[in-house]
Interface confidence: low
């Protein structure tokens, strides 16, 4: 899942912490005001920047969706860490959602490599 | 299927008010921010205003400020552009585009066909 | 000096591969900012093409097929769209976007006209 285009649905609350930007940019973890002129930190937990930036938001942290597990959550610096839950793999070509992964190998092929997260079991042909 | 479709363009003299719309459908409307972007005859894209999803939040460009009014009604899955005090430079073709977010981004995923604006007297 | 430079035109043979460029002026650091990039074919509305930040992080516009690809030069702050097999469809405006700095305000590359050669 990539929510890097997505913003939070919230305003800036005035308690968040300002520094000042350098050369137009804020830090990790911070985004720019409307006027250029603060930097104001995003909200732990619910959105984050990861790059000197001059974003007017924070990027909006990810939920892991049903079938998948947290791995680390969302920081004022990262993104949550989503893996796709046990028997279940993410493909590189449908990334959006996870497969389950086949119990074994067809008729004339052995197993040669297990379930993982990012692959389903491997199977070759029996020499 | 995503579907954007401009109306309200026509003739208008300089200095007199037009109003767009955009009928939005095949999407949940209220989640995205929405874009005018406009385009002159023979020319290049001028982004003109922007409005993120509630409505809460509205942008334009310097040479519209003071003059054109973003608006949305979510209850219709509408966009709006007021148009006031216009000038023989608002001459383009408007279009209406969905931002890939809910605020405002510069990924605009889909756009509809535009509706020209034509001011002379 | 447009914050966005796009060569105004060019032109390749049917088959071949191009790629297009998009400069961003050197007191902005493309490093920080994703290339958006629009197709307009001639009286047509523009079209999404793709977005590309990083080679992990980039997203492809809705039916948009794999021959358009975008690639990013941090040192020489530019940002380029390749498209290869070039077929005589791909003749079109091409437009980069990226943010302008402290500002929502979209602003778009004055655009590339690609011709393709038969």
């Known amino acids: 899942i990539t929510q890097q285009d997505l913003a939070p649905q919230q305003r800036v609350a005035p308690q968040q912490k300002r520094s000042s930007p350098s050369e137009g940019l804020c830090p990790p973890g911070h985004h720019i005001s409307e006027d250029g002129r603060d930097c104001i930190s995003c909200k732990y937990g619910q959105d984050y920047s990861t790059h000197w930036n001059d974003l007017l938001f924070c990027l909006r942290c990810t939920r892991c969706d049903s079938g998948e597990v947290e791995l680390s959550p969302c920081t004022t610096t990262r993104n949550t860490v989503c893996q796709c839950e046990e028997g279940t793999f993410r493909e590189e070509d449908s990334p959006e959602m996870c497969r389950k992964c086949r119990t074994g190998c067809p008729r004339g092929m052995v197993k040669v490599g297990d379930c993982t997260p990012w692959s389903d079991i491997e199977c070759v042909h029996k020499e | 299927e995503v579907q954007l479709v401009e109306s309200g363009g026509g003739l208008v003299k300089p200095g007199g008010s037009l109003r767009l719309s955009c009928a939005a459908s095949?999407?949940?409307?209220?989640?995205?921010?929405m874009h005018w972007v406009r385009q002159a005859p023979g020319k290049g894209l001028e982004w003109v205003a922007g409005?993120?999803?509630?409505?809460?939040?509205?942008y334009y460009a310097d040479s519209v400020k003071g003059r054109f009014t973003i608006s949305r009604d979510n209850a219709k899955n509408s966009l709006y552009l007021q148009m006031n005090s216009l000038r023989a430079e608002d001459t383009a073709v408007y279009y209406c585009?969905?931002?890939?977010?809910?605020?405002?981004?510069?990924?605009?995923?889909?756009w509809g066909q535009g509706t020209l604006v034509t001011v002379s007297s | 000096q447009p914050v966005l430079h796009q060569p105004p035109a060019m032109s390749s043979a049917l088959g071949t591969t191009i790629r297009l460029t998009c400069t961003l002026r050197n007191d902005h650091d493309i490093g920080v900012y994703s290339v958006y990039w629009y197709q307009q074919r001639p009286g047509h509305p523009p079209r999404f093409l793709l977005r590309?930040?990083?080679?992990?992080?980039?997203?492809?516009g809705p039916q948009v097929p794999p021959r358009f690809s975008g690639s990013k030069d941090v040192a020489r702050n530019r940002g380029y769209l390749s498209i290869s097999e070039l077929q005589p469809e791909d003749e079109a405006m091409y437009y980069c976007a990226m943010g302008a700095r402290s500002s929502v305000t979209h602003v778009f590359g004055s655009g590339t006209q690609l011709t393709v050669l038969s």
């Open positions: 095949g999407f949940t409307f209220s989640t995205y921010g």
């Open positions: 409005i993120n999803y509630s409505g809460n939040n509205k």
């Open positions: 585009a969905r931002d890939h977010s809910t605020w405002l981004s510069r990924h605009l995923d889909y």
């Open positions: 590309y930040f990083s080679q992990s992080d980039k997203s492809q």
